[in-house]
């Protein structure tokens, strides 16, 4: 066998994108590799060029259609292959039978905005992006708030165990700058994982009212 270890991981965004990462120890950075997608019950097939993202890791996106088109369902199986060029021929490196709705990772939530802010509270809303209508309300969210002098890793996670696209942050400090992020995960799928974190939303609480003399 080829020496070292390799890893091939793909996720479906629930609409029209399968994102894949291929890594192999000892593989040359300029190796030319592709991912080929062959659905079992669709007339299309798709290929993407793996591009380096780190020392021994490559990634690409299989674009299956327009961003909000529903290209796959829970009964689909897509056979995914990693093929790398060796001289004049292509060599198979990995094959996976991929069930899209068992391997979900949604796009990061978008359109974060402050609905209302007070001295100690802030109400924030967001939207999910390119998420399948199949989920109906079967989604959950995690959120975190960055306080001054702390890192994102130190921020406690707040869990919303339902499809709730808003949150009311409480016990905040007046006249203080904060940042807020949220991510989403469908309840479905054995290998489903959290979306990336949203872009941070910066906000400032209102100053406390001056006390009367």
């Amino acid at each position: 066998a080829v020496n070292g270890t390799s890893r091939f991981t793909c996720f479906y965004n629930s609409r029209a994108n399968i994102s894949c990462v291929w890594s192999q120890d000892g593989a040359l950075q300029d190796t030319s590799c592709q991912v080929h997608a062959w659905p079992d019950r669709r007339r299309w097939n798709q290929t993407c060029e793996l591009l380096p993202v780190s020392q021994a890791s490559w990634a690409c996106n299989l674009i299956l259609g327009t961003p909000d088109s529903q290209k796959l369902t829970a009964v689909d199986i897509v056979t995914l292959r990693v093929m790398c060029r060796e001289g004049v021929r292509w060599r198979m490196m990995a094959i996976q039978d991929f069930k899209p709705f068992e391997n979900l990772r949604l796009m990061a939530p978008i359109s974060l905005q402050v609905v209302h802010v007070e001295t100690h509270r802030c109400n924030i809303s967001w939207k999910i992006s390119q998420a399948s209508h199949y989920f109906e309300r079967h989604l959950e969210f995690e959120a975190r708030t960055l306080s001054p002098g702390h890192t994102w890793e130190e921020a406690p996670l707040m869990t919303l165990k339902q499809k709730q696209e808003w949150i009311c942050l409480e016990t905040l400090t007046p006249d203080t700058q904060y940042e807020f992020q949220v991510r989403v995960k469908p309840l479905q799928g054995e290998f489903t994982t959290w979306s990336p974190w949203s872009q941070p939303l910066a906000f400032r609480t209102k100053p406390a009212a001056l006390g009367k003399d």
Partner: nanobody
């Protein structure tokens, strides 16, 4: 507990056929690709053949293509490797392996103990 158990190995003459098998626990068999690797004395472990769990897509090493056939019996949680026109260079310890992917690297998640195949000239 994950268990992969190979059987069917033995001593044969060059040009003969042999079928080796691998029995797997149910959860592994229904959710993982299965494959065969082999290791000859003093040599590195070599990918032989693999088969995916849903579409039964197969892949073979160039050295066995056209001579070996991998198959799986989902009803019995068993995988087989039919080896025809065996050659002395096919002599090795044959391992069954399971992983989410067929990979040509020998870092699959689960492994059996191996069954010895010896081809005499």
């Amino acid at each position: 507990e994950v268990q992969l158990v190979e059987s069917g190995g033995g001593l044969v003459q060059a040009g003969d056929s042999l079928r080796i098998s691998c029995a797997a626990s149910g959860r592994i068999f229904s959710n993982y690709a299965m494959g065969w690797f082999r290791q000859a004395p003093g040599k590195e472990t070599e990918f032989v053949a693999g088969i995916t769990h849903l579409t039964s897509t197969t892949h073979y090493a160039d050295s066995v293509k056209g001579r070996f056939t991998i198959s799986r019996d989902n009803a019995k949680n068993t995988m087989h490797l039919q080896m025809n026109n065996l050659k002395p260079e096919d002599t090795a310890l044959y391992y069954c392996a399971a992983d989410r992917n067929i990979k040509i690297t020998a870092d699959w998640s689960y492994w059996g103990q191996g069954t010895q195949v010896t081809v005499a000239s």
